[in-house]
Amino acid sequence: FNISGCSTKKLLWTYSTRSEEEFVLFCDLPEPQKSHFCHRNRLSPKQVPEHLPFMGSNDLSDVQWYQQPSNGDPLEDIRKSYPHIIQDKCTLHFLTPGVNNSGSYICRPKMIKSPYDVACCVKMILEVKPQTNASCEYSASHKQDLLLGSTGSISCPSLSCQSDAQSPAVTWYKNGKLLSVERSNRIVVDEVYDYHQGTYVCDYTQSDTVSSWTVRAVVQVRTIVGDTKLKPDILDPVEDTLEVELGKPLTISCKARFGFERVFNPVIKWYIKDSDLEWEVSVPEAKSIKSTLKDEIIERNIILEKVTQRDLRRKFVCFVQNSIGNTTQSVQLKEKRG
């Protein structure tokens, strides 16, 4: 299809080389009228539609994204060629930063319902650059935490080094929906609830004498509880002896509950004590079996292919640790009688 009639928008993604971050493009088609996407007579190619990335229309989730190769080759279907780019309804998610993401992205409705809809498309020229200015060393992270029940704020990473007075007008989105009230470089939350969690996008316009473009940043916001003040507790095994049958396989499970920590480095290990010999068994890996806002339950098993006489004199010790402290539980195997 002919993309010369598409409305054009220029975006800049300045990514930090120090952290992982994502990026999104919204399919900013104009508001549909009478279930149509748009009509040519409602929009000249020079006009930029208002930001309505998710308009509640079922139709609009059915858009097609393309990338325009720089060498003039035909448009490429994003889904087929770019595994690190995911389409979710109207939004294009870039999972990894990099200058190779620079280029022209075109979106248009999949279903063309009238001849006027042919020109109903948006072309986004995305420029991706690594952050070079070291002047702002403490710029806001692309992953921000809000403490439940307290006050907090979400900062726009690309503007976090500027004072509120200097800051340009910012357009904010949360999970793709426009937050029309928010216009500053910081969203202040009076009391944090779990619904404040989500993907926030902040946009502002930057201009020079030739053109203007939108600078965009994406912030993943997580609502959290305060760090635990307790060391982990072992839920299983409870008993310090376990009746077993010789020659039979055996799995001993260690389940431990770890309270929430912002910097979470849980340790769960099995040690074996045999006379003066003590060593760690680290296979298989630990796995999380339950995760809530307040805590996480992690399990690690030790697998004995068959219980031998030697195992009866060994102590199997589960060791768990967080930043507060550690807990151990040892198990001695006992042969089942009769």
Epitope: W270, D274, S275, L277, W279, V281, S282, L304, E305
Partner: antibody, heavy 121, light 111 residues
Framework: SVEESGGRLVTPGTPLTLTCTVS????????MTWVRQAPGKGLEWIGI?????YTYYASWAKGRFTISKASTTVDLKITSPTTEDTATYFC???????????????????WGQGTLVTVSS | ALVMTQTPSSVSAAVGGTVTINCQAS??????LAWYQQKPGQPPKLLIY???DLESGVPSRFKGSGSGTEYTLTISDLECDDAATYYC?????????????FGGGTEVVVK
């Protein structure tokens, strides 16, 4: 794989370090052991270094040998060789005690080709 | 210290025949025993562990048995390639015993 090196002719009393280089597996998951064999004689167990880095020695070898490890190597130091230490020294991987993989019965499942040490004046 | 006594020191049999090697531990090692085959100029090769479990890739002609202090390696349908020295090894770690004691070895000659 497992490969020993460092074997050579030494004079009695001259310390000698043999190196066992491993590839394809991690020393943080396995215990490694040293075994020697004097010419025309049987196998003699020297000592073991387990995944956590602790070492254990045969009663006759204590004080005469030191085992240590780095990320991909296990060293055996013969502190003060005598002519009785002339032998081929083998390094072997232990599946069992001191390894991350719990097994019902231990075994030495992977051996190097050995390195010859000759102690002579 | 734990002592492993292997008998006989040498055994000879014809191709297709059977040989039996015995290994006695000075204390109960609860089936924690491995058997190895060694050919001249080569490292030992694991055959059997846990007294009777066959290492993968080892022919079923090699059979281990025994318990407590008495263990046996039986090689049936003898082949020329079986000519080697065979060692038993205790793998029963004990604070009062040497960790992994080997037997003295048995030379198998195939006629």
């Amino acid at each position: 794989s497992v490969e020993e090196s460092g074997g050579r002719l030494v004079t009695p009393g001259t310390p000698l370090t043999l190196t066992c280089t491993v590839s394809g597996f991690s020393l943080s998951n396995y215990a490694m052991t040293w075994v020697r064999q004097a010419p025309g004689k049987g196998l003699e167990w020297i000592g073991i270094i387990i995944n956590t880095g602790y070492t254990y020695y045969a009663s006759w070898a204590k004080g005469r040998f030191t085992i240590s490890k780095a990320s991909t190597t296990v060293d055996l130091k013969i502190t003060s060789p005598t002519t009785e230490d002339t032998a081929t020294y083998f390094c072997a991987r232990v599946l069992g005690a001191g390894s991350s993989y719990y097994t019902s019965y231990d075994r030495l499942d992977l051996w190097g080709q050995g390195t010859l040490v000759t102690v002579s004046s | 210290a734990l002592v492993m006594t292997q008998t006989p020191s040498s055994v000879s049999a014809a191709v297709g025949g059977t040989v039996t090697i015995n290994c006695q531990a000075s204390q109960n090692i609860y089936s924690n025993l491995a058997w190895y085959q060694q050919k001249p100029g080569q490292p030992p090769k694991l055959l059997i562990y846990g007294a009777s479990d066959l290492e993968s890739g080892v022919p079923s002609r090699f059979k281990g048995s025994g318990s407590g202090t008495e263990y046996t390696l039986t090689i049936s349908d003898l082949e020329c390639d079986d000519a080697a020295t065979y060692y038993c090894q205790s793998t029963y770690y004990n604070i009062s015993a040497d960790f992994y004691a080997f037997g003295g070895g048995t030379e198998v000659v195939v006629k």
